[in-house]
Amino acid sequence: FKVATPYSLYVCPEGQNVTLTCRLLGPVDKGHDVTFYKTWYRSSRGEVQTCSERRPIRNLTFQDLHLHHGGHQAANTSHDLAQRHGLESASDHHGNFSITMRNLTLLDSGLYCCLVVEIRHHHSEHRVHGAMELQVQTGKDAPSNCVVYPSSSQDSENITAA
């Protein structure tokens, strides 16, 4: 399977909400021994590999923001902790999963990564990730709404193996 990032750049005004999106593509094993661990974290554009460094989003680690379920099932993060930080991650049964960030500030600008780990019980793991950039702008020149730009075909299917 692959992870696609439909959009690679989000340019938003301060105070706006934004939903960053990834999509799980390809054949997904729905067997009983397979679960999917989906999460989000911040990173930086490494010289060797993007998303290799895992940093928290608004003080929440990738463990705090994870979704854990089988196949293309719907899920949401535990509301209390994430929502106190203005965050919510969600997943639907079409393979889309997202993180919503509320009341953006300049400190939210940066590189965001979605991570999917396919866990086969008693066997191996398969990991893929996608990356996107969030630019939060302030002042009179900021856009009035988030402007969202597509990934190039090269970027839109970010595939990494464990």
């Epitope: 005004p13 009179k140 020149d141 009035s144 402007v147 597509p150």
Partner: antibody, heavy 118, light 106 residues
Framework: EVQLVESGGGLVQPGGSLRLSCAAS????????MSWVRQAPGKGLEWVAE????????YYPDTVTGRFTISRDNAKNSLYLQMNSLRAEDTAVYYC???????????WGQGTLVTVSS | EIVLTQSPATLSLSPGERATLSCSAS?????MYWYQQKPGQAPRLLIY???KLASGIPARFSGSGSGTDFTLTISSLEPEDFAVYYC?????????FGQGTKLEIK
């Protein structure tokens, strides 16, 4: 007052090249993404290119990818569109546009006509 | 790509009547923009951020809507209002336009 003034249009043969310019004034040019929009005679409006405020990101629809190049010179408050391998279907009025902000709507220039014909 | 569908394609009304132009987006967008265009002229911004009136535009023009359905209303048509109207989204690249609604004198 925000002003966008396009220039560089004209008659060119199929396969030829043309460079359009847009002179911007009345706002902090380097803070805005800028775009080119075109309108073929009797037709609707079509986005043809955008460039980010710093110039590092450029975007094109499939119809012009590989043929058109958008660029900017923030020191000169100028936007450019280099058009190569021009086709008859590129005949249109080309407008320079600036997106809106938190307090104001978008702005457009008055356009420059590009005619591709032999 | 977000497709914007304007309806009707042509609207025939008389001066003094109320005009309602619709714009439907294939996916949800934050804001809609409306332009008026007359022959040989550049598009003129009427409404930005869905409902804000652009500078110099008469108060008879108004915009509303959210998500996928947006409306431009002209409360009482003046002779100079007969033109082509375009909606546009500036949210998801490519920043698409509707195909236009021609407002003509009945």
């Amino acid at each position: 007052e925000v002003q966008l003034v396009e220039s560089g249009g004209g008659l060119v043969q199929p396969g030829g090249s043309l460079r359009l310019s847009c002179a911007a004034s009345g706002f902090t040019f380097s803070s805005y993404a800028m775009s080119w929009v075109r309108q073929a005679p009797g037709k609707g409006l079509e986005w043809v290119a955008e460039i980010s405020s710093g110039g590092s990101h450029t975007y094109y629809p499939d119809t012009v990818t590989g043929r058109f190049t958008i660029s900017r010179d923030n020191a000169k408050n100028s936007l450019y569109l280099q058009m190569n391998s021009l086709r008859a279907e590129d005949t249109a009025v080309y407008y320079c546009a600036r997106r809106g902000n938190l307090y104001d709507g978008p702005y457009w220039g008055q356009g420059t006509l590009v005619t591709v014909s032999s | 790509e977000i497709v914007l569908t304007q309806s009707p394609a042509t609207l025939s009304l008389s001066p003094g009547e109320r005009a309602t132009l619709s714009c439907s987006a294939s996916s949800s967008v934050s804001h809609m923009y409306w332009y008026q265009q007359k022959p040989g002229q550049a598009p003129r911004l009427l409404i930005y951020d869905t409902s804000k009136l652009a500078s110099g535009i008469p108060a008879r023009f108004s915009g509303s809507g959210s998500g996928t359905d947006f409306t431009l209303t002209i409360s009482s048509l003046e002779p100079e209002d007969f033109a082509v109207y375009y909606c546009q989204q500036w949210n998801f690249y490519p920043f698409t336009f509707g195909q236009g609604t021609k407002l003509e004198i009945k």
